[in-house]
């Protein structure tokens, strides 16, 4: 009789992650007595994936019944694939023997590849907030896929980017990889409603590529222009200036104002105005008592914004002069208005 | 759901023998081995031997080996485990053990006293 | 024989603390035949880990095995009060098949 050969029908077998993966092996004979094994590599390293008769084995089902006396079929299907799974799969027949059993005839293998999706891209940008034309840093990451193969761009609003620098891990041979890509962004002062998008496209996502977004409201900062100007006169002996603090990002800012430089009134923007690119305006009223100077007056209004230094803008009152308006007469756009009474 | 049951206790002379069963329910008796595995009070686990309920090949431990008889009913799905010339030393908890090593019976007690 | 030799024999430590056992074989044995128990008094012992790393079903993620040739070790993070017990660890690596003496984990 013809001796046994154990045939592994498929040399490769591609699966995607999450699925069953099907490795079909064949027995020609009976003969000789003994069980069959599946394991995962060659030689003494090679890792044990089913053994019908003993051990546990909760992933691995039998396509046919083994117990069957005459079966030949010792096909099996491993669940839930993960790309940890990927590598070659032998089907062993062993006959019995004292006090173990004895490999016979292995079959050829059956090379098990797993396509896994990457994981959603993670766009994260720089610690600080910088200010237009300032060139910054963002970075995108992505996980788990296979094969190594992966296609990566950078969009800044639909805009392809060029100046970027990508890294998939490890370099060699892995069941799964990474990519690591590192893109440079020129900041403007409209970028408040931009947006960053990292693109990866893979052969397990259909054409269908995962983005990753970075909004750049969360590292831009536009600092504030300040203009200060008179206003016409509401009485005799009162003057009316206005600090109109216009085209700043974020909001978070603080006014103060300062007469001959001392301090007379400090306050939060509140009630500001958003302008279509993103940015805020906001105007600061000082209702100043003429009469109660006797040199002239120089008035500041100091903006702290964002947590930076100080800038500021100066207004010179004269007292001797009769009170008429003075200074810059531009209208404000979009101004908002807080009004305070100094006697 | 998987089964294990086995016999009840048991007392028994030095010489003497002792047979235990274990019934099987709950999956393909043959499918896999049946390992029997002893404890011996306030001591660790021993493994005796395993049956093959397929065709009854047995493997035993060598210190075993001259006293123990393992062997299975398929028509019941029941395996045996007989332990003969019974020393004091032989009292024990008996485990039969599917081969999964997953499902364990809930043990018999075998006390060997004069 | 396989001698596998566990270590400590008992285990003294309080709920939350992180208990490691070892076990080490006295010829190497492939990981896929590394298993480990845990037996609580009058119960028949337990699965808690097959072939070196991968838990059984039911068993928290607070328990981890891991290790390779001769040396293994079961590792739980965190003592929860129903830890407290007998853990054993056994090969099938080749026969006889054997067990270890065992480490009691035991409430300090």
């Known amino acids: 009789e013809e001796e046994l050969q154990v045939i592994q029908p498929d040399k490769s077998v591609l699966v995607a992650a999450g699925e069953t993966a099907t490795l079909r092996c064949t027995a020609t004979s009976l003969i000789p007595v003994g069980p069959i094994q599946w394991f995962r590599g060659a030689g003494p390293g090679r890792e044990l994936i089913y053994n019908q008769k003993e051990g546990h084995f909760p992933r691995v089902t039998t396509v046919s019944d083994l117990t069957k006396r005459n079966n030949m079929d010792f096909s099996i299907r491993i669940g839930n694939i993960t790309p940890a799974d990927a590598g070659t799969y032998y089907c062993v027949k062993f006959r019995k023997g004292s006090p173990d059993d004895v490999e016979f005839k292995s079959g050829a293998g059956t090379e098990l590849s797993v396509r896994a999706k990457p994981s959603a891209p993670v766009v994260s940008g720089p610690a600080a907030r910088a200010t237009p034309q300032h060139t910054v840093s963002f970075t995108c990451e992505s996980h788990g896929f296979s094969p190594r193969d992966i296609t990566l761009k950078w969009f800044k609003n639909g805009n392809e980017l060029s100046d970027f620098q990508t890294n998939v891990d490890p370099v060699g041979e892995s069941v799964s990889y990474s990519i690591h890509s590192t893109a440079k962004v020129v900041l403007t002062r409209e970028d408040v409603h931009s947006q960053v998008i990292c693109e990866v496209a893979h052969v397990t996502l259909q054409g269908d590529p995962l983005r990753g977004t970075a909004n750049l409201s969360e590292t831009i900062r536009v600092p504030p222009t300040l203009e200060v100007t008179q206003q016409p006169v509401r009485a005799e002996n009162q003057v009316n200036v206005t600090c109109q603090v216009r085209k700043f990002y974020p909001q978070r800012l603080q006014l103060t104002w300062l007469e001959n430089g001392n301090v007379s009134r400090t306050e939060t923007a509140s009630t500001v105005t958003e302008n279509k690119d993103g940015t805020y305006n906001w105007m600061s009223w000082l209702l100043v008592n003429v009469s109660a100077h006797r040199d002239d007056v120089k008035l500041t209004c100091q903006v702290e914004h964002d947590g930076q230094p100080a800038v500021s803008k100066s207004h010179d009152l004269k007292v001797s002069a009769h009170p008429k308006e003075q200074g810059s007469n531009t209208a404000a756009e979009n101004t908002g208005s807080n009004e305070r009474n100094i006697y | 759901q998987v089964q294990l049951v086995q016999s009840g206790a048991e007392v028994k002379k030095p010489g003497a023998s002792v047979k235990v069963s274990c019934k099987a329910s709950?999956?393909?008796?043959?499918?896999?081995?049946m390992h029997w595995v002893r404890q011996a009070p306030g001591q660790g686990l021993e493994w005796m031997g395993r049956?093959?309920?397929?065709?009854?090949?047995?493997k035993y431990n060598p210190k075993f080996q001259d006293r123990v008889t393992m062997t299975v009913d398929t028509s019941t799905n029941t395996a045996y485990m007989e332990l003969s010339s019974l020393r004091s030393e032989d009292t024990a908890v008996y485990y039969c053990?599917?081969?999964?090593?997953?499902?364990w019976g809930q043990g018999t007690t075998v006390t060997v006293s004069s | 024989e396989i001698v596998l030799t566990q270590s400590p024999g008992t285990l003294s430590l309080s709920p939350g603390e992180r208990a490691t056992l070892s076990c080490r074989a006295s010829?190497?044995?492939?990981?896929?035949?590394l298993y480990w128990y845990q037996q609580k008094p009058g119960q028949a012992p337990r699965l808690l880990i097959y072939s070196t790393s991968n838990l059984a079903s039911g068993i928290p993620d607070r328990f981890s095995g891991s290790g390779s040739g001769t040396d293994f070790t079961l590792t739980i993070s965190r003592l929860e009060p129903e830890d407290f017990a007998v853990y054993y660890c056994h090969q099938w690596y080749s026969y006889p098949r054997t067990f270890g003496g065992g480490t009691k984990v035991e409430i300090k």
């Open positions: 709950g999956f393909n008796f043959e499918d896999t081995y």
């Open positions: 010829s190497s044995v492939s990981s896929s035949y």
């Open positions: 053990v599917r081969g999964n090593y997953v499902n």
């Open positions: 049956i093959d309920p397929a065709d009854g090949d047995t």
